[in-house]
């Protein structure tokens, strides 16, 4: 029985050109995390394998950095990065847990209504 829950950073609105950290945390289970996949829509961004460490997809190597922890840092954001990101935790013996984060990337000139944007 899968008892775990995934907590995420929550949805994020950020400015074009900035960087953000996507993080998920698996709790309420003693299952062993064997691998974490980070995906956007149907694209694989990165894998963190318990034994083999990090692998960043070649098409994202310039703008994606591993960590902190099992999280992922996206840099030099573009409006095209807007979309849903998935952290997929492969665990034993529970199976797969998935967290979801929606990232909205805005042109810096459209900071309307006094929005507080994330540029760490």
């Amino acid at each position: 029985m899968m008892t775990g829950t995934i907590e995420t950073t929550g949805n994020i609105s950020a400015e074009k050109g900035g960087s953000i950290i996507l993080q998920c945390h698996l709790s309420s289970t003693t299952a062993q995390v064997t691998q974490v996949n980070w995906e956007q829509q149907d694209q694989l961004l990165a894998i963190c394998n318990a034994d083999l460490g990090w692998h960043i997809s070649p098409s994202f190597k310039d703008r994606v950095a591993p960590g902190p922890g099992l999280g992922l840092t996206l840099q030099s954001l573009t409006v095209n990065d807007t979309g849903e990101y998935f952290c997929i935790y492969h665990t034993y013996p529970d199976g797969t847990y998935t967290g979801r984060i929606f990232l909205e990337v805005l042109e810096s000139s459209v900071a309307e209504h006094g929005a507080r944007f994330q540029i760490p």
């Epitope: 907590e7 949805n11 409006v79 807007t82 979309g83 979801r100 929606f102 459209v110 929005a115």
Partner: antibody, heavy 119, light 112 residues
């Protein structure tokens, strides 16, 4: 002036599928998410999902995965939501609503499309 | 999914009253950068819902200043001072911090 014009009411048979449209005007269409909301029994509101026209990125409420499909036609500034394999549970008013940039809220709403599923 | 619980379900008022509507979330609505995506809407039969408050406490354009929002974390409040006839209807809170976005069950503001 921001306007969202939805297609008219629909009466459809159980098991059928249908597509609702939402034509946007008065703003830069590709720069804002378009969301879809279901209102059942004139009361409960449920977020079905969204699309970002700039890159056609979508996000769905998993409760409606396989039930709703959201698409966009940038040439006509129109967003569509297709509802599949309709049952009486899908009878409701469906709204499109523009996302408020930077705040994950819904700032402008269409007039709603009433869908009745009945044999 | 995040559960949004609104209280009360029904709120009988007299014109001129001041009222508060509560919205509680099953988990914190602050994201990792400290932003909280909580908004309030008014729905009147025959109309579409419309935005009143976004980002906890920001009034949307055209919304009278008798509407105010407050709160943090999991506990949020919409206050309406000096109730007017056009304020009657269903009020909903919406969280947009976590996927999927979820609405509260609504609070019906009606005349006593």
């Amino acid at each position: 002036e921001v306007q969202l014009q939805q297609s008219g009411p629909e009466l459809v048979k159980p098991g059928a599928s249908m597509k609702i449209s939402c034509k946007a005007s008065g703003y830069s269409f590709t720069g804002y998410t378009m969301n879809w909301v279901k209102q059942s029994h004139g009361k409960n509101l449920e977020w079905l999902g969204l699309i970002f026209p700039y890159n056609s990125a979508t996000s769905y409420n998993q409760k409606f995965t396989g039930k709703a499909t959201i698409t966009v036609d940038k040439s006509s500034n129109t967003t569509y939501m297709e509802l599949l394999s309709l049952t009486s549970e899908d009878s409701a008013v469906y709204y499109c609503a523009r996302g408020l940039r930077g705040f994950f809220a819904l700032d402008y709403w269409g007039q709603g499309t009433s869908v009745t599923v009945s044999s | 999914d995040v559960v949004m619980t609104q209280t009360p379900l029904s709120l009988p008022v007299s014109f001129g009253d001041q009222v508060s509507i509560s919205c509680r979330s099953s988990q914190s609505l602050a994201n990792s950068y400290g932003n909280t995506y909580l908004s309030w809407y008014l729905y009147k039969p025959g109309q579409s819902p419309h935005l009143l408050i976004y980002g906890i406490s920001n009034r949307f354009s055209g919304v009278p200043d008798r509407f105010s929002g407050s709160g943090s974390g999991t506990d949020f409040t919409l206050k309406i001072s000096t109730i007017k006839p056009e304020d009657l209807g269903m009020y909903y809170c919406l969280q947009g911090t976590h996927q999927p976005w979820t609405f509260g069950g609504g609070t019906k503001l009606e005349i006593k």
